[in-house]
């Protein structure tokens, strides 16, 4: 059976397509090609008489067609109007006709797309943004990329208009992008330049750094305030409720105890109209803001119950500190046998009993800081009594 095949089936605009003929009868008188699904002289492309090798162009001939002796038809520089069906009619030598119909599809070489947006400066949690991939072309697949990744599944992302429009519902600051759209058809693909969103947000609750609360007199107090915000926040400082300055940094040299108080950072975003504040307490004191870790020592760690005594000592180089003791998470002393001495640096247990076995540690502290020692384990043994022979004479 006579058949035709398009090579290729999907053709890029401007390229060429060959309508190949299979199972062409051996003895032919002539053949004709037609645009469409039937023999129609109004749509004849070319008629070809084998014997005379004479080609007669028809009304559908554009000058871009070449017919070959094997009945194949080459169409060059194809346009989208060339898309469709093509019918070959062959006149066999016995004057019997045969027909075959084939088709191909012409697709444009796609241009570089671009992204248009209905709102390039949306406000976080308030605005929606619709991106549209331009241009609109027929037989085209539209794809979207965010941060070079295909679209995540999200209820805030909606595709419409044949995937040509991407809508972000209730934008967040993480939706800045970049966004790219890609257009595809069977013969070409092209991706837009990236587009980023300028999401207006904030300010968030400010953070004051450093986090230190305690300062020694004579030190410099340097505080910095930061609140996530777009556009960047405008900052101002208040001390004990009194406005100081409109800067992000607050610097007070050579502080005294009089500089103790509440320090407020005020962040403002003029676009969103939102304000946020954070209050930090600053204490200026001679006391060490950081107490070093104390060391704990025992006169012995393994003792005999009801016989031995033991001394535990807590050592620290810090001054102006207090010491307290803990045993099994309980504060000591917890019995008459436990005594504290030398400003609580020494814990004496006399005599040691079985219930005194376990973990001990000490803690040093001042009004603004504290630190614990590593734990120490006290083991309590009891000597075994010699057994008497209780056997009666036999």
């Amino acid at each position: 059976q006579l058949t035709t095949e398009s090579m290729p089936f999907n053709v890029a605009e401007g390229k060429e397509v060959l309508l190949l003929v299979h199972n062409l009868p051996q003895q032919l008188f002539g053949y004709s090609w037609y645009k469409g699904e039937r023999v129609d002289g109004n749509r004849q492309i070319v008629g070809y008489a084998i014997g005379t090798q004479q080609a007669t162009p028809g009304p559908a001939n554009s000058g871009r067609e070449t017919i070959y002796p094997n009945a194949s038809l080459l169409i060059q520089n194809v346009t989208q109007n060339d898309t469709g069906f093509y019918t070959l009619q062959v006149i066999k030598s016995d004057l019997v006709n045969e027909e075959a119909t084939g088709q191909f599809h012409v697709y444009p070489e796609l241009p570089k797309p671009s992204i248009s947006s209905n709102n390039s400066n949306p406000v976080e949690d308030k605005d929606a943004v619709a991106f549209t991939c331009e241009p609109e072309t027929q037989d085209t697949t539209y794809l979207w990329w965010i941060n070079n990744q295909s679209l995540p599944v999200s209820p805030r992302l909606q595709l419409s208009n044949g995937n040509r429009t991407l809508t972000l519902l209730s934008v967040t600051r993480n939706d800045t992008g970049p966004y790219e759209c890609e257009i595809q058809n069977p013969v070409s693909a092209n991706r837009s330049d990236p587009v980023t969103l300028n999401v207006t947000y904030g300010p968030d609750t400010p953070t004051i750094s450093p986090s230190d609360t305690y300062y020694r007199p004579g030190a410099n107090l340097s505080l910095s305030c930061y609140a996530a915000s777009n556009p960047p926040a405008q900052y101002s400082w208040l001390i004990n409720g009194t406005f100081q300055q409109s800067t992000q940094e607050l610097f007070i040299p050579n502080i005294t105890v009089n500089n103790s108080g509440s320090y407020t950072c005020h962040a403002n975003n003029s676009v969103t109209g939102c304000n946020r504040t954070t209050v930090k307490t600053i204490i200026v004191t001679e006391l060490s803001p950081v107490v070093a870790k104390p060391q704990i020592k025992a006169s012995k760690t393994t003792v005999t119950g009801d016989k031995d005594s033991v001394n535990l000592t807590c050592s620290t180089n810090d001054t102006g500190i207090s010491i307290r003791w803990f045993f099994k998470n309980q504060s000591l002393p917890s019995s008459e046998r436990m005594k504290l001495s030398q400003g609580n640096t020494t814990l004496s247990i006399n005599p040691v009993k079985r219930e005194d076995a376990g973990t001990y540690w000490c803690e040093v502290f001042n009004p603004i800081s504290k630190n614990q020692s590593d734990p120490i384990m006290l083991n309590v043994n009891y000597n075994a009594l010699p057994q008497e022979n209780g056997l009666s004479p036999g």
């Epitope: 008188f29 004709s32 023999v39 002289g41 004849q44 014997g51 007669t56 028809g58 030598s93 004057l95």
Partner: antibody, heavy 120, light 106 residues
Framework: QVQLQQSGAELVRPGTSVKVSCKAS????????IEWVKQRPGQGLEWIGV????????NYNEKFKGKATLTADKSSSTAFMQLSSLTSDDSAVYFC?????????????WGQGTSVTVSQ | DVQMTQTISSLSASLGDRVTISCRAS??????LNWYQQKPDGTVKLLIY???RLHSGVPSRFSGSGSGTDYSLTISNLEQEDIATYFC????????FGGGTKLEIK
């Protein structure tokens, strides 16, 4: 130049047969078709059939199947039409014509015609 | 089968006239229409094929047009030698002729 020379006029009895010839010259005989056309006195043209001299393939008007038989002799570049079982209805001038293909068919050169008279 | 009809069987015209002869097909023949001239001596010539294409050697005063089922032959400047009968013919697998239009001088 292209010429189609037909045989002379025929006077024949009813019920007999007649064979009209058409000798082609001035072109390659086997690469065109030969068509046969009937014209009764004072009437229009009526297509009888066509032959491909290169292959002997034929196509007939349904009305003339069994009446006309088309043949061709490549060696003498001559086409023939035999009409059988003649009646007075067969009295006419018969033309042969060369036909070429352009997607359809057109008869571009014609013979001078052969008059066949069927009479007692 | 496709029937071809030439409704005007004869017409008279003066030399120099523009003459149009019409032909109708019983169905769309897709421009596969030919025109023939038969002189009074019986000789037949192809004038136009494929509706509007002039056969070689035919004077340019002859032209053809039409589409679908309606076709026409026009002689733009009638000459004495154009006195003849004109036949249309559809050129599909089974050819058929119109009844003819006889052109005479007034």
């Amino acid at each position: 130049q292209v010429q189609l020379q037909q045989s002379g006029a025929e006077l024949v009895r009813p019920g007999t047969s007649v064979k009209v010839s058409c000798k082609a010259s001035g072109y390659a005989f086997t690469i065109y078709l030969i068509e046969w056309v009937k014209q009764r006195p004072g009437q229009g043209l009526e297509w009888i059939g066509v032959i491909n001299p290169g292959s002997g393939g034929t196509n007939y008007n349904e009305k003339f199947k069994g009446k006309a038989t088309l043949t061709a002799d490549k060696s003498s570049s001559t086409a023939f039409m035999q009409l059988s079982s003649l009646t007075s209805d067969d009295s006419a001038v018969y033309f042969c014509a060369r036909s070429y293909y352009y997607g359809s068919f057109a008869m571009d050169y014609w013979g001078q015609g052969t008059s066949v008279t069927v009479s007692q | 089968d496709v029937q071809m009809t030439q409704t005007i069987s004869s017409l008279s015209a003066s030399l120099g006239d523009r003459v149009t002869i019409s032909c109708r097909a019983s169905q769309d023949i897709g421009n596969y229409l030919n025109w023939y001239q038969q002189k009074p001596d019986g000789t037949v010539k192809l004038l136009i094929y494929y509706t509007s294409r002039l056969h070689s050697g035919v004077p340019s005063r002859f032209s053809g047009s039409g589409s679908g089922t309606d076709y026409s032959l026009t002689i733009s400047n009638l000459e004495q030698e154009d006195i003849a009968t004109y036949f249309c013919q559809q050129g599909n697998t089974l050819r058929t002729f119109g009844g003819g239009t006889k052109l005479e001088i007034k």
